[in-house]
């Protein structure tokens, strides 16, 4: 029907109209080229580098990883975007001064076990939750 | 004991050493003033503004809200930070060129029910998950 065609056009417009030329902003990023899309980056963290070597016995460090990258329109399936992030992306395109892009954050985190000295010099084995990034997404 | 004193000093150092003067970065935000800490901001989204008024029957819009603000050292209890975010904050302080700060993202999201026309002009009532930000945190 005409109304369903109109609705379909409207849905298309809501995506097509956002396929805009990227505008440079005075941002942290060199605006002459796009930043890569949100993804997991590898990062090994040494407890000595953090200054924790005197109280953490083992491990010496661990693969913490981190999330970084753009959550720009259009958010594709690899970006594990929530419905809210999809809405926020559209709002950001229309009101970039007021609403930021969604951010690239961990979607899956794993624990690690740490052997350490407590304040009384007892040796403790403890599982620390949410220490390792396994996957990232736009939130 | 001396070893436990050394461990305590080491723990203190890992925080004290980060109490550095804030340096401006060439960011999207006016760097002459500090950005506020990560928190929930209110945002009403009108489906008409998104161009979805022809297929969404009700509601006309909803309180989507969004997360924004700094996830800077030290991350306090209000910031709902994960263990990974705490580690990443320290790594960022020591290697800001390589590792970003954790980002301010939703920690609690709610659903909303939407009445809409599908592609065949049927009226559908559907619950859309993760549409409303209820709380934010550093991730």
């Amino acid at each position: 029907s005409a109304s369903s065609r109109r609705r379909q056009q409207s849905r298309n417009r809501s995506t097509q109209s956002q396929d805009v030329a990227r505008v440079s902003s005075a941002s942290d990023y060199n605006s002459s080229e796009l930043k890569t899309a949100c993804r997991k980056h590898e990062l090994y963290v040494s407890f000595q580098d953090l200054g924790w070597q005197d109280w953490i016995i083992a491990p010496k460090g661990y693969a913490a990883n981190y999330c970084d990258g753009e959550c720009s329109f259009p958010l594709n399936a690899h970006m594990n975007a929530t419905n809210h992030a999809i809405v926020q992306t559209l709002v950001h395109l229309m009101n970039p001064e007021y609403v930021p892009k969604p951010c690239c954050a961990p979607t899956k985190l794993n624990a690690i076990s740490v052997l350490y000295f407590d304040d009384n010099s007892n040796v403790i084995l403890k599982k620390y939750r949410n220490m390792v990034v396994r996957a990232c997404g736009c939130h | 004991s001396a070893s436990s004193r050394r461990r305590q000093q080491s723990r203190n150092r890992s925080t004290q050493s980060q109490d550095v003067a804030r340096v401006s970065s060439a960011s999207d935000y006016n760097s002459s003033e500090l950005k506020t800490a990560c928190r929930k901001h209110e945002l009403y989204v009108s489906f008409q503004d998104l161009g979805w008024q022809d297929w969404i029957i009700a509601p006309k819009g909803y309180a989507a809200n969004y997360c924004d603000g700094e996830c800077s050292f030290p991350l306090n209890a209000h910031m709902n930070a994960t263990n990974h975010a705490i580690v990443q904050t320290l790594v960022h302080l020591m290697n800001p060129e390589y590792v970003p700060k954790p980002c301010c993202a939703p920690t609690k999201l709610n659903a909303i029910s939407v009445l809409y026309f599908d592609d065949n002009s049927n009226v559908i009532l559907k619950k859309y998950r993760n549409m409303v930000v209820r709380a934010c945190g550093c991730h």
Partner: antibody
Framework: QVQLVQSGAEVKKPGASVKVSCKAT????????FHWVRQAPGQRFEWMGW????????EYSQKFQDRVTITRDTSATTVYMELNSLKSEDTAMYFC???????????WGQGTLVTVSS | EIVLTQSPGTLSLSPGERATLSCRAS???????LAWYQQKPGQAPRLLVY???KRATAIPDRFSGSGSGTDFILTINRLEPEDFAVYYC?????????FGRGTKVEIK
């Protein structure tokens, strides 16, 4: 071998701008961050800012925030530092330096002397 | 901002002698992030020591670093003629990256 080669000496008038280049060879350019540091006569080294050439992230010292711009050209494996609104106090030797993750400034350019004089 | 104070300002020694250079920080920081550089007139600084005590590539073993907390030392055993230069300490554990004023090691 790792080399950072900077552009030649410059003489500028107060109020003018200067753009110094730093050409990197002998390593994978895009996996490093580069810093700019200056050394005025009789003064300590002064850190100006950095750029991560892989993603373009950059940060400037509060002191130079309004006057300095650090950029890079990945195809030319070159980093640039532009300083505007020059004053006589900006007369100094300007150095680029490479910094690896967790590391110190392990390699430096030979320096570029910028003289600001009317 | 971590302020680094180097002493003495000038050290007058003869070849073969030992030089002991001091660098004191305004606040405690991990020794992981303390470096020493050597600079000769008209040249760029050269990395000698990082992590307070690790020698950089191709640096002779007469150079050694030590210290932690706020007090750091660079020792040059048996000074060679080419060691007469200015030495700087640096904090590289995040911005702002800061340097000491330097210690000049000159021939007596």
């Amino acid at each position: 071998q790792v080399q950072l080669v900077q552009s030649g000496a410059e003489v500028k008038k107060p109020g003018a701008s200067v753009k110094v280049s730093c050409k990197a060879t002998g390593f994978t350019f895009i996996t490093y961050a580069f810093h700019w540091v200056r050394q005025a006569p009789g003064q300590r080294f002064e850190w100006m800012g950095w750029i991560n050439v892989g993603n373009g992230n950059r940060e400037y010292s509060q002191k130079f925030q309004d006057r300095v711009t650090i950029t890079r050209d990945t195809s030319a494996t070159t980093v640039y530092m532009e300083l505007n609104s020059l004053k006589s106090e900006d007369t100094a030797m300007y150095f680029c330096a490479r910094r690896p993750l967790w590391g110190p400034f392990d390699y430096w350019g030979q320096g570029t002397l910028v003289t600001v004089s009317s | 901002e971590i302020v680094l104070t180097q002493s003495p300002g000038t050290l007058s020694l003869s070849p073969g002698e030992r030089a002991t250079l001091s660098c004191r920080a305004s606040q405690i920081f991990s020794n992981t992030f303390l470096a020493w550089y050597q600079q000769k007139p008209g040249q760029a600084p050269r990395l000698l020591v990082y992590g307070a005590s690790k020698r950089a590539t191709a640096i002779p073993d007469r150079f050694s670093g030590s210290g932690s907390g706020t007090d750091f030392i660079l020792t040059i055993n048996r000074l060679e003629p080419e060691d007469f230069a200015v030495y700087y300490c640096q904090h590289y554990g995040g911005s702002p990256w800061t340097f000491g004023r330097g210690t000049k090691v000159e021939i007596k």
